[in-house]
C-alpha cells in the first residue's frame, strides 16, 4: 500500500435545500484506470462511511446502496454532492481515494471538509 496526497476544502456550507458540494482532488502517481472514492463522516464519537463509488477513469461514478451522494469525475478530481442534509448532519466529511487498478495500490485520505448545515426557518403564516 502506497500513500497518496488528497486535497479537499476545509469548510463548506450546505445550501438551504440541504445540499453540499465539494471537490476531492488526488495526486495520482500513475495512470489509474479504476478508482474507488469513499466519503466518511467523523462526528458524534463515530466514523461512518456515508457513501462509496468505484469508477473507471472517464466514466461516471456509480454509488452503492440508496445513496445520498452523487458525483462526477474529471481527471484527478472528483466533484462530490451530498443531498438531504439537515442541521444534525453537520460534521467532518473525509474523502478517501483508492487507486485500485493497475497495481500498485495507492491510498489517500484527505483532512476532511467541515460541512455546516443550517435548517431553514419555516415560512411565517401569511394573510395573503
Amino acid at each position: 500500500c502506497k500513500a497518496m496526497h488528497v486535497a479537499q476544502p476545509a469548510v463548506v456550507l450546505a445550501s438551504s435545500r440541504g445540499i453540499a458540494s465539494f471537490v476531492c482532488e488526488y495526486a495520482s502517481p500513475g495512470k489509474a484506470t479504476e478508482v474507488r472514492v469513499t466519503v466518511l463522516r467523523q462526528a458524534d464519537s463515530q466514523v461512518t462511511e456515508v457513501c462509496a463509488a468505484t469508477y473507471m477513469m472517464g466514466n461516471e461514478l456509480t454509488f452503492l446502496d440508496d445513496s445520498i451522494c452523487t458525483g462526477t469525475s474529471s481527471g484527478n478530481q472528483v466533484n462530490l454532492t451530498i443531498q438531504g442534509l439537515r442541521a444534525m448532519d453537520t460534521g467532518l466529511y473525509i474523502c478517501k481515494v483508492e487507486l485500485m487498478y493497475p497495481p500498485p495500490y495507492y491510498l489517500g485520505i484527505g483532512n476532511g471538509t467541515q460541512i455546516y448545515v443550517i435548517d431553514p426557518e419555516p415560512c411565517p403564516d401569511s394573510d395573503f
Epitope: 461512518t48 456515508v50 457513501c51 462509496a52 452503492l64 446502496d65 440508496d66 445513496s67 444534525m88 448532519d89
Partner: nanobody, 126 residues
Framework: EVQLVESGGGLVQAGGSLRLSCAAS????????MGWFRQAPGKEREFVAA???????SYKDSVVGRFTISRDNAKNTVYLQMNSLKPEDTAVHYC????????????????????WGQGTQVTVSS
Amino acid sequence: EVQLVESGGGLVQAGGSLRLSCAASGGTFSSYAMGWFRQAPGKEREFVAAISPSGLTSYKDSVVGRFTISRDNAKNTVYLQMNSLKPEDTAVHYCAAGQWTWSPLRVSRLAEYNYWGQGTQVTVSS
C-alpha cells in the same frame, strides 16, 4: 421474522483477539443493515459497529483500527473481528438487524434495529 444467534465470545487476555459471528435466519439478510452493540454491567447498551447491505461500515471511535465488521451474504452471517482487546471491551455483545436507508445518524440508534440476538459474553482480563 428474523432470528439472530451470536457466537464466538469468551475469556481472553488483554491484547488478544476474538471473532464474533452472528447467524441470521428467517429474512432477506442481504437487505438488512447489521449492527453490533455491547452492554457492560451497570451501563447502557452502546453502539460498536455497523455494516450496510453493500458493505459500507461505521465504527465507534474507540474501536477504530482494532475492530473490523464484515458480512457474508451467502452465509447470512455478520462478523466482528476484535483485535488488541482491552479490559474496557468487557461486555455482552449483541447483534442487531434493521431495514432503513443507510445514514450516519441512524447506525448507532438502538431504535432503528428491529431484531436482536440474545448476546454473547466477551471478558477481557488484564
